[in-house]
């Protein structure tokens, strides 16, 4: 009967600068969770006796747990799970619908910061503690989050890792967007769109790192065996990613229609709305659905491609099948085929 | 971030008024549909009201003509204009918005209608 007692509960705290503090999210069979505060019995208001989740607190390698409650801002790009029993029980959860789910917050307290001695002890044969190995994604100037060059620290070496096109990586993938608390892997990114063409002028962390890594275990487990250090490499790609946790995401409206859930999609990344042309990537209802989804509408009911007769229409295009899967917008400035969607009615 | 903060919530009698206000901060410009929901003592959440940028509105059944949902672009607030309230209109009532496929919740106001 799994619980947050158990030696092996993997657990982690997202959505926050610190891994002591965020969104309760949980490794169950299939992968992440977000746990929402209204699991077992709880109202979603309920704070609870902290000390209950002091087991989470130290195998996170953190400080004792200062609260328990709902987390203030609910974000949930992956699934979530409400779980009944005693509290600190995972053996019988659900998914629950992402929109009806408040996630579950937990702070502990920060470990204590050493600060090292002034005089330098006589050397002993215990080795000193390193930092953990860790990675960063490095984007480029007004770049976005979970988006850019993959660097990989070890103790006090870091750099960046080379990648052939043709390695077989996709669960390395998947555990480095992980890692990074970015989600799953979407896709590879040139090295013009991660940025790794740096300005003379920029600040000296983010010229490039004196150490390349190379991919040493594709199905790694834990960073430190997944790379091996090499000598730089003056040519060559390095591994940059884009994450599914990504901003700014695309947003979408319904405009023109007679209702909150009908109209002619429009789409924005940030800075003005355009309509959203029609795509061949897109002809399945997948892509309508989010955009559903997004109004708070129902399901999608119809789609249908507005004719494109005029040469002087002009929107946006995503080359994916779904909007949230596309980082970049793409202009189109000619022979623009809106798509005008029905969704139902919100009301179950 | 996205941050949605309720309030205006209270005890008030069968046949009174309350307006509700969502004030949302953080990436506020861009969430185009905010929706108030509201959750009974051991019952489902249910949608109450939605209303979009362009101040287009749908209601659920059960709170049409009673209620109506505005919204302040400028001020980046939301209002539930609650009128004729009844017994079971008591709740936890939440703003909810998306930024893409990712949700925000505010904390919730509790309203409890007195008969």
């Known amino acids: 009967r799994l619980s947050w007692y158990d030696p092996d509960f993997q657990a982690r705290l997202t959505r926050s600068n610190s891994k002591c503090q965020g969104q309760l999210e949980v490794y169950l069979k299939d992968g992440w969770h977000m746990v929402c505060s209204q699991s077992w019995g709880r109202s979603s208001k309920q704070w609870e006796d902290p000390s209950q989740a002091s087991k989470v607190c130290q195998r996170l390698n953190c400080g004792v747990p200062l609260s328990l409650g709902p987390f203030l801002v609910t974000y949930t790009p992956q699934s979530s799970i409400i779980c009944y029993g005693q509290l600190g029980s995972f053996s019988n959860c659900s998914h629950s619908r992402n929109d009806m789910c408040h996630s579950l917050g937990l702070t502990c307290l920060e470990p204590q910061k050493t600060t090292p001695p002034t005089t330098r002890p006589p050397p002993t044969t215990t080795p000193e503690p390193t930092a953990p190995p860790r990675l960063q994604l490095v984007a480029q100037s007004g770049g976005q989050h979970c988006a850019g060059v993959v660097e990989f620290y070890s103790g006090s070496l870091g750099g960046t890792i080379s990648y052939e096109a043709q390695d077989k990586t996709q669960d390395l993938e998947n555990f480095l967007c992980n890692n990074l608390q970015c989600g799953s892997f979407l896709k590879h990114l040139p090295e013009t769109e991660a940025g790794r063409a740096q300005d003379p002028g920029e600040p000296r962390e983010h010229q490039p790192l004196p150490i390349q890594w190379k991919i040493q275990n594709s199905s790694c487990t834990s960073l430190e065996h997944c790379f091996r250090k090499i000598k730089p490499q003056k040519s060559g790609r390095v591994l940059a990613l884009l994450c599914s946790g990504f901003q700014p995401k695309v947003q979408s409206r319904l405009v023109g229609g007679s209702s909150i859930c009908e109209g002619t999609v429009e789409v924005r990344q940030g800075a003005q709305w355009a309509a959203l042309c029609d795509s061949s990537s897109a002809r399945s209802s997948l892509r309508w659905e989010e955009v559903c989804r997004e109004q708070q509408c129902g399901s999608v009911n119809s789609y249908r491609v507005l004719d494109a007769g005029d040469p002087t229409s002009r929107g946006l295009f995503c080359p994916h099948q779904k909007l949230s899967q596309c980082h970049e917008l793409w202009e189109r400035n000619s022979y623009c085929k809106k798509v005008f969607v029905t969704c139902q009615d919100p009301n179950p | 971030q996205v941050q949605l903060q309720e309030s205006g919530g209270g005890l008030v009698q069968a046949g009174g008024s309350l307006r509700l206000s969502c004030a949302t901060s953080?990436?506020?410009?861009?969430?185009?549909?905010i929706g108030w929901y509201r959750q009974a003592p051991g019952k489902q959440r249910e949608l109450v009201a939605l209303v979009n940028s362009g101040g287009q509105t749908h209601y659920a059944d059960s709170v049409k003509g009673r209620f109506t949902i505005s919204r302040d672009n400028a001020k980046n607030t939301v209002f539930l204009q609650m009128n004729s309230l009844k017994p079971e209109d008591t709740a936890e009532y939440y703003c909810?918005?998306?930024?893409?496929?990712?949700?925000?919740w505010g904390e919730g106001t509790q309203v409890t209608v007195s008969s």
């Open positions: 909810h918005g998306r930024y893409g496929i990712d949700n925000y």
């Open positions: 953080g990436i506020t410009s861009s969430i185009n549909v």
